[in-house]
């Protein structure tokens, strides 16, 4: 690219420059979950820590009631990791009895709710069958990608089974987004 | 957003503009690990390639002695993948003998060391039970998230067992960070 | 950072400023794959949706014939998730017969093709042994990292077995890149 292509006088015409430190950003970390009602056929949403420890929200990116609220339109990188842990899945127990089986599974979905659409939009899904041999198992599912979001959109993280989420450490289960 | 909100004269007051190509960035790739002493109860740190092949450091982001050194304060996206491989885990061998068992596991931790804080801070952890049926197993753990770092902070990647790390290919095991 | 370090007059000398919204970006989502010929010992490449649903390309980042075409040199964050699903792997069937076995595996590779270089470069690889106990299994492999790319470079996603890729939902299998 030629330097003159992006001289300030030219840029202001079609796309304002902005300081990177001024962009909406959030990194949320896990907290102990309280069982909550959720819609039939919709996985429950996790709630998050937004200001203690490693967690933060800045530049008008707000967290409230399980949602990250997008304060300005643009392209965002969104990510989450959920660490699950459980006892031996039913699947392997059934198998020992010699019967065919459908595996148990763990699923994470990053969901967008927008005022212009009557259904949540699933942006990212990580889903894994769990058919463990050992008596205790644990494993993370990581997701991350870029999406075009609108001012006012809300983001949440849904999981297939809230009781399997490892809420013990802020570095194991987290959720974040930042304007590119 | 209105163009005038971000006119250069306004921006300079509260947050300097900067060229994106001038930001600290690094992508490090795996090398063969030399066994090193590490403190009891602390996972060993990996060392990395920082200039050959796909690896690079730029704009004052330096790599030295297993650490990435943060040259300026700001919000960074930090990521790593470690590919592990091993023989059948003890866990499944024990299980075949009919005894209950605690699964083996593999763990990756991205750790921050700060001069002003006596303890390393675990930023990200990926941990997985390994109870494999087959005689040889291999799998990656991927981590990535955004953190607010201070000039002088040091980042490293720790693993539960350095002997299980796949060091054969630069695309399988890597570590990186960039200023947003 | 001191404001004057990045005053416009200084910046223009060595690195042009540019509006973030003007940077090349793409998020591609899975479509049903048509079986295609591929060279022996080379994994087949996936093709993608580039404009419907969550998918988009912008600012001269173009998708054509399985490739993302890089329109300008710079540092890019590149990511992909591929969700695989299959029936019980041969590996566990063999094991039941009491024979030692080499596990089946699933692999994703993000590959760069450069006109000036005869061989494709593997940028990222996620590979996992699959030795599942249950009759149906499914799991994602996620990859993401930063690379210095040149104008004209082409990116693709290769997989070990195209028939195991879950193409049913745009949030399960995807591929993206953006200029930092």
């Amino acid at each position: 690219l030629k330097g003159q292509e992006f001289a300030p006088s030219h840029q202001q015409v079609y796309a304002p420059l902005r300081a990177d430190g001024d962009k909406p950003r959030a990194h949320l970390t896990v907290v102990r979950q309280t069982p909550t009602q959720h819609f039939k056929n919709q996985f429950p949403a996790l709630h998050w820590e937004h200001e203690l420890g490693l967690a933060f929200t800045k530049n008008r990116m707000n967290y409230t009631n399980k949602f990250l609220l997008i304060p300005e339109s643009g392209d965002y990188f969104i990510y989450s990791q959920v660490t699950f842990r459980g006892m031996t899945s039913e699947c392997s127990e059934i198998r020992q009895a010699g019967r065919p089986n459908k595996p148990d599974s763990i699923t994470v979905v990053i969901t967008k709710v927008t005022d212009s659409y009557p259904e949540p939009t699933q942006l990212l899904m990580g889903t894994k069958s769990v058919c463990e041999v050992g008596s205790n198992w644990f494993q993370p599912i990581y997701l991350g990608a870029m999406f075009s979001l609108q001012e006012g959109d809300k983001l949440m993280v849904n999981v297939s089974d809230i009781s399997l989420v490892d809420y013990t450490k802020e570095d194991k289960t987290f959720f974040g987004a930042f304007l590119l | 957003l209105k163009g005038q909100e971000f006119a250069p004269s306004h921006q300079q007051v509260y947050a300097p503009l900067r060229a994106d190509g001038d930001k600290p960035r690094a992508h490090l790739t795996v090398v063969r690990q030399t066994p090193t002493q590490h403190f009891k109860n602390q996972f060993p740190a990996l060392h990395w390639e920082h200039e050959l092949g796909l690896a690079f450091t730029k704009n004052r982001m330096n790599y030295t002695n297993k650490f990435l050194l943060i040259p300026e304060s700001g919000d960074y996206f930090i990521y790593s993948q470690v590919t592990f491989r091993g023989m059948t885990s003890e866990c499944s061998e024990i299980r075949q003998a009919g005894r209950p068992n605690k699964p083996d596991s593999i763990t990756v931790v991205i750790t921050k060391v700060t001069d002003s804080y006596p303890e390393p801070t675990q930023l990200l952890m990926g941990t997985k039970s390994v109870c494999e049926v087959g005689s040889n197993w291999f799998q990656p753990i991927y981590l990535g998230a955004m953190f607010s770092l201070q000039e002088g902070d040091k980042l490293m990647v720790n693993v539960s067992d350095i002997s299980l790390v796949d060091y054969t290919k630069e695309d399988k095991t890597f570590f990186g960070a960039f200023l947003l | 950072l001191k404001g004057q370090e990045f005053a416009p007059s200084h910046q223009q000398v060595y690195a042009p400023l540019r509006a973030d919204g003007d940077k090349p970006r793409a998020h591609l989502t899975v479509v049903r794959q048509t079986p295609t010929q591929h060279f022996k010992n080379q994994f087949p490449a996936l093709h993608w949706e580039h404009e419907l649903g969550l998918a988009f390309t912008k600012n001269r980042m173009n998708y054509t014939n399985k490739f993302l075409l890089i329109p300008e040199s710079g540092d890019y964050f590149i990511y992909s998730q591929v969700t695989f699903r299959g029936m019980t792997s041969e590996c566990s069937e063999i094991r039941q017969a009491g024979r030692p076995n080499k596990p089946d595996s699933i692999t994703v590779v993000i590959t760069k093709v450069t006109d000036s270089y005869p061989e494709p470069t593997q940028l990222l690889m996620g590979t996992k042994s699959v030795c599942e106990v249950g009759s149906n299994w499914f799991q994602p492999i996620y990859l993401g990292a930063m690379f210095s790319l040149q104008e004209g470079d082409k990116l693709m996603v290769n997989v070990s077995d195209i028939s195991l890729v879950d193409y049913t939902k745009e949030d399960k299998t995807f591929f993206g890149a953006f200029l930092l």
């Epitope: 609220l69 005022d115 212009s116 259904e119 809300k154 | - | -």
Partner: antibody
Framework: QVQLQESGPGLVRPSQTLSLTCTVS????????MHWVRQRPGRGLEWMGR????????KYNPSLKSRVTITRDTSKNQVSLRLSSVTAADTAVYYC?????????WGQGSLVTVSS | DIQMTQSPSSLSASVGDRVTITCRAS?????MYWYQQKPGKAPKLLIY???NLASGVPSRFSGSGSGTDFTFTISSLQPEDIATYYC?????????FGQGTKVEIK
């Protein structure tokens, strides 16, 4: 059962402020967005604005922005509309609408007449 | 503002007829919505995202289109379908509705 119920005075004097309240039941308001839409006699539908109840973030129709205010009280499960400096042209049926993340639901509407 | 031009403004058809209403946006929109409003009642959502049938809506209603041109169809008109139908875009600010199409039975 999901319900939205608009309430408020049916008659407002010109130049005064029109105030309506929407009380919701059967769902958690903070999971959605709440809108006000009006329909003037013999005319089509006009979107006035919306609020994101969890944060209070609002968006308004630019043609009404100087006169309209939408607020919420999540503890009472209520959303309120205020329209200042009304004229006869603001005579309409005012609807409270839920959207986002759940199927759209409209209240039955509240007729407000602006007259001296 | 994004202008929504709906046509026709009214139509008369027989029971069992196929009825088609079109809506043109002054600029491209991603999502289009279709509502039914009966006299003295609130509008009811029929179609969202251009082609998705809202819950509980009979399958004789359908929607199609993308960009600027959208179509709403009743495959077999029924007496209870007598109403005014509105298109709406929810993307630009402000959200805007078409002027409505009044459907009557011959």
């Amino acid at each position: 059962q999901v319900q939205l119920q608009e309430s408020g005075p049916g008659l407002v004097r010109p130049s005064q402020t029109l105030s309506l309240t929407c009380t919701v039941s059967g769902f958690d308001m903070v999971d959605t967005y709440m809108h006000w839409v009006r329909q003037r006699p013999g005319r089509g539908l006009e979107w006035m604005g919306r609020i994101e109840p969890a944060s209070g973030h609002t968006k308004y129709n630019p043609s009404l922005k100087s006169r309209v205010t939408i607020t919420r009280d999540t503890s009472k499960n209520q959303v309120s509309l205020r329209l200042s400096s009304v004229t006869a042209a603001d005579t309409a049926v005012y609807y409270c609408v839920r959207s986002g993340g759940l199927p759209d639901v409209w209240g039955q509407g509240s007729l407000v007449t602006v007259s001296s | 503002d994004i202008q929504m031009t709906q046509s026709p403004s009214s139509l008369s058809a027989s029971v069992g007829d196929r009825v088609t209403i079109t809506c043109r946006a002054s600029q491209g929109v991603g999502y289009m919505y279709w509502y039914q409003q009966k006299p003295g009642k609130a509008p009811k959502l029929l179609i969202y995202g251009a082609s998705n049938l809202a819950s509980g809506v009979p399958s004789r209603f359908s929607g199609s289109g993308s960009g600027t041109d959208f179509t709403f169809t009743i495959s077999s008109l029924q007496p209870e379908d007598i109403a005014t139908y509105y298109c709406q875009q929810w993307e630009g600010n402000p959200r805007t509705f078409g002027q409505g199409t009044k459907v009557e039975i011959k």
